[in-house]
Interface confidence: low
């Protein structure tokens, strides 16, 4: 009997608080070998499936769901699940995407922190302008 599939994680880049008209990417992560990720809205009334799965680290795969220009209609709670070897995983935690104007220059990157389900620190291409990592077992998105 196969054991339970690892629970996926969910995060948003550059953050979970996004000004209207700005892009956001919701990232779902699971184990290596995932066949398909699904991103669901809170009530499951809307979902988006993708088989465009990449290796995020030696032990993780990921899918990226990009919204090019967010609006109030994109605000809400999202969660991920995946299919591996014909089995569905359980759901990730919810991610709360907030769409609102932020103070200051909206042309600059959104610097508000992600939710607790957000991404961990990761190595950088130019370590002087990104966070340094805590350890290897983290997102390797920077490598893509």
């Amino acid at each position: 009997q196969e054991g339970p599939l690892p629970r996926p994680s969910i995060s948003a880049e550059p953050g979970t608080v996004i000004p209207p008209g700005r892009p956001v990417t919701i990232v779902c992560r699971g184990p290596v070998g995932v066949d398909q990720f699904r991103l669901e809205r809170e009530d499951r009334s809307k979902f988006n499936d993708t088989k465009d799965v990449s290796q995020a680290s030696p032990s993780e795969s990921e899918a990226r769901f990009r919204i090019d220009s967010v609006s109030e209609g994109n605000a809400g709670h999202y969660r991920c699940l995946y299919v591996k070897s014909t089995r569905w995983s359980e759901h990730s935690d919810y991610l709360d995407l907030v769409v609102k104007e932020t103070s200051g220059d909206t042309d600059s990157p959104v610097t508000e922190p992600d939710s607790s389900a957000g991404p961990t620190q990761r190595p950088s291409d130019n370590s002087h302008n990104e966070h340094a990592p805590a350890s290897q077992g983290l997102s390797a998105e920077h490598l893509y």
Epitope: S54, S127, G137, Y144
Partner: antibody, heavy 117, light 107 residues
Amino acid sequence: EVQLVETGGGLVQPKGSLKLSCATSGFTFNINAMNWVRQAPGKGLEWVARIRTKNNNFATYYADSVKDRFTISRDDSQSMLYLQMNNLKTEDTAMYYCVRGPYFDYWGQGTTLTVSS
Amino acid sequence: DIQMTQSPASQSASLGESVTITCLASQTIGTWLAWYQQKPGKSPQLLIYAATSLADGVPSRFSGSGSGTKFSFKISNLQAEDFVTYYCQQLYSTPYTFGGGTKLEIK
């Protein structure tokens, strides 16, 4: 089977130009960062350049030794990687390898560049 | 830039013995370190990634350890085909620097 095949090497005079190509197959090219690594005769390995994916705006990075002279590019529709080399110097003489990111897990067989007058 | 200092530059050993190669990073790199083997006239081959993880198809006599700034690579029960050159590389930040290499020779 993953394959990376470099072409375009040859003999070039100093200050000349050359473009290397890398044809790839057997994996999903457009979701992988790609790199060029070189090795001068009898010397060690030197990372040259890297290009990220479309999701990351095709960001590029270069070794200081080639910055402003070399340009890395990719054609996701053809699963091709390129390295345009300008203002070549004798110290650029090396075997050039196309390498799949992110973990440098697949390398091409290499193509030789000789810069000499 | 991060400097990678690999030692020794060359080492002699006998068949069946074990050897250890060390790589020191000039600043902390977590475990963003890889080890490669290169045979004469061939392309490098990934052996170890993430400092300790064995790449697909690599025999278990190869192993890696370490984190932060000090890393080790061990080959146990040396076989004839192991007497080639090995490199470490940091993948923490660009430029992705390599160590200078270690050439293993039969004693």
